[in-house]
């Protein structure tokens, strides 16, 4: 039975050209995390695997950095980065947990920062 829950940064905003940390946290389960996939819509951004470490998808290598932890740092943000991001936790024995984050990249110099895990 899947008892875990994923806490995410929720809806967040950031300035064009800046950086943002996407962060999810799995709690309330003793399941082991085999792998975390980060996806933007249906496109793979990155993988963090318990046995093999980090992989950043080639098309994002220049602007995506692993961490902190199982999170992901997006750099040199553009307006095109606005959209939904998903952290997909593949766990054993529970199965798959998915968290959603909505990022809005603003042209303005004043970006409202959302919930937790933000870069100040």
């Amino acid at each position: 039975m899947m008892t875990g829950t994923i806490e995410t940064t929720g809806n967040i905003s950031a300035e064009k050209g800046g950086s943002i940390i996407l962060q999810c946290h799995l709690s309330s389960t003793t399941a082991q995390v085999t792998q975390v996939n980060w996806e933007q819509q249906d496109q793979l951004l990155a993988i963090c695997n318990a046995d093999l470490g980090w992989h950043i998808s080639p098309s994002f290598k220049d602007r995506v950095a692993p961490g902190p932890g199982l999170g992901l740092t997006l750099q040199s943000l553009t307006v095109n980065d606005t959209g939904e991001y998903f952290c997909i936790y593949h766990t054993y024995p529970d199965g798959t947990y998915t968290g959603r984050i909505f990022l809005e990249v603003l042209e303005s110099s004043v970006a409202e920062h959302g919930a937790r895990f933000q870069i100040p």
């Epitope: 082991q32 792998q35 996939n37 793979l44 695997n49 093999l52 998808s57 054993y92």
Partner: antibody, heavy 120, light 110 residues
């Protein structure tokens, strides 16, 4: 359609070397962990080696450790297996295999295999 | 000797249900995923089951996988003559940091 095509097999003398190649098509090669698996005549399947996405992590079966080297060229969508100090017991069909996006799930696509015969 | 233990042979008649077992340990089957492969004579292995009980698209629902503790099993219901093949269980071994295969089970359809 996802495809793997092995080449480079042949007849080689004990102590000799051989380099196998596996050309991948139909998927984003960079995003997947790859393995080599072999099958001696009339025997079962035996895992040989695994390589992560960019080649910085590799694992080997004890039977080939120190003699075989797995590598990949993501720009050419190609997986390699360099086999040195070959022995009669290395005679087998060698298959390359693509793993699921979560590599621990197993291997979902296999090539047709290339035959290696070690004999004097 | 294989790290995972399978019976060397199994048999059944058309329409029957056949189960193939695979026994391992805490470092592979009990705490990891199991996949099953079918190898028809003279061909490359084909994936039947992954993630212990998931079937890839294109694999008939006559094939099912299950797992309990350090053992896994593959069940084939409504056995057909084309199911005659070798079947292998596989798991990632966390301690050995290697893929471990069962020795294979030769299924004969009588």
């Amino acid at each position: 359609e996802m495809q793997l095509l092995e080449s480079g097999g042949g007849l080689v003398q004990p102590g000799g070397s051989l380099r196998l190649s596996c050309a991948a098509s139909g998927f984003t090669f960079d995003d997947y962990v790859m393995s080599w698996v072999r099958q001696a005549p009339g025997k079962g399947l035996e895992w040989v080696s695994l390589i992560n996405w960019n080649g910085d992590k590799t694992y080997y079966a004890d039977s080939v450790k120190g003699r075989f080297t797995i590598s990949r060229d993501n720009s050419k969508n190609t997986l390699y297996l360099q086999m040195n100090s070959l022995r009669a017991e290395d005679t087998a069909i060698y298959y390359c295999a693509k793993h699921w996006i979560v590599f621990q799930y197993g291997m979902d696509v296999w090539g047709q295999g290339t035959t290696v015969t070690v004999s004097s | 000797q294989s790290v995972l233990t399978q019976p060397p042979s199994a048999s059944g008649t058309p329409g029957q249900r056949v189960t193939i077992s695979c026994s391992g340990s805490i470092s592979n089957i009990e705490t990891k995923y199991v996949s099953w492969y079918q190898q028809l004579p003279g061909t490359a292995p084909k994936l039947l089951i992954y993630n212990s009980d998931q079937r890839p698209s294109g694999v008939p629902d006559r094939f099912s996988g299950s797992k309990s503790g350090t053992s896994a099993s593959l069940a084939i219901s409504g056995l057909q003559s084309e199911d005659e093949a070798d079947y292998y269980c596989v798991s990632w071994d966390a301690s050995l940091k290697s893929w471990v295969f069962g020795g294979g089970t030769k299924l004969t359809v009588l």
